[in-house]
């Protein structure tokens, strides 16, 4: 049997026998285009493709539509994998989304959606989510039904304002909504009463800017 040499996600890498967390090269579906991603092979059975990570404010998340489309940052640290890759990947098979959160008091929580996909660029990478469970709130902090993605140079929200400019970062803003994991990073003791921080309302409430966040996806049938 010939060994698989290209992988579409971290679940395929895990199943191939590579079970150490780290940076791996993934290939776009139906293409030879490649992208580097961080694979978490430890959390909940492994096989997770990390699509977003925040931990220290070292990367500027107030980026353009093109940058959010293609991805930015470093997979070893803070980064955004890229809307186009995630859209193509989640359009092919059913994926789950796990969001891991850390606050400044040493607490951790997560939200798990049992079906996640992004529409294509023609639909502004609109987010689709169902089946919320987890410890980071019984109500989804990503507005339902899902919103279009907005950035500082592409305003697709439902607000009379421009949410991405007002709150900072690209996100699936509503008007503007109960979350923004791509907001401005604030250090400890400067992280409350923030209008533009890293927000997950149904866990930490209003104005609380989180310490760390990770968004990761895995096939539902893993």
């Amino acid at each position: 049997k010939e060994e698989q040499t290209t992988f579409r996600d971290c679940a395929e890498i895990f199943k191939s026998g590579l079970t150490t967390s780290g940076i791996y090269t993934l290939t776009f579906p139906n293409s030879t285009e490649e992208i580097k991603a961080y694979c978490d092979m430890d959390v909940g059975g492994g096989g997770w493709t990390v699509i977003q990570h925040r931990e220290d404010g070292s990367v500027d998340f107030q980026r353009t539509w093109k940058e959010y489309k293609e991805g930015f940052g470093s997979p070893l640290g803070e980064y955004w994998l890229g809307n186009e890759f995630v859209s193509q990947l989640t359009g092919q098979h059913r994926y789950v989304l796990k969001i891991q959160l850390k606050d400044w008091e040493g607490n951790e929580a997560h939200s798990l959606y049992d079906h996640f996909y992004l529409a294509g660029e023609e639909s502004n990478y609109r987010i689709h989510l169902t089946g919320l469970t987890g410890t980071a709130g019984k109500i989804s902090s990503i507005s339902q039904p899902g919103s279009d993605f907005s950035t500082k140079d592409s305003d697709n929200d439902k607000c009379i304002c421009k949410c991405s400019q007002m709150l900072s970062g690209g996100w699936w803003f509503d008007a503007c909504g109960p979350s923004n994991l791509n907001g401005q990073y604030y250090p400890q003791k400067q992280n409350t009463n923030k209008f533009n921080g890293i927000k997950w309302y149904y866990w930490k409430g209003s104005g609380y800017s989180l310490k760390a966040t990770t968004m990761m996806i895995r096939p539902a049938d893993f």
């Epitope: 439902k158 607000c159 304002c161 209008f195 309302y201 209003s206």
Partner: nanobody, 129 residues
Amino acid sequence: EVQLVESGGGLVQPGGSLRLSCAASGFTLDDYAIGWFRQAPGKEREGVSAIRSSGGSTYYADSVKGRFTISSDNSKNTVYLQMNSLRPEDTAVYYCAAVPAGRLRFGEQWYPLYEYDAWGQGTLVTVSS
């Protein structure tokens, strides 16, 4: 640093009056809406009243209409809640909170609770004989 400080709470008899103050610092009221919220023991936090200083628009919950009046003094960067004809069911901790005035859904007049990102520590109002 954004700060909101409430004052003016206390013990008052039914039918009495109180005036709460919300002093804001770190931002100017012109660009923000200020809401008053209250939370009674064992109950959810609820919106009482709100004001957009720039346009002078005000909002009142049905339970306080005709009894409470919200106003602002932009020169003092302070918002007031005048509470008349107080009832025992008005007993609660009262909070003021701020939201950028523009953070408003098309076609809507006021803001959901989760849009208010800056909060004060609260002031206790007790209505009892």
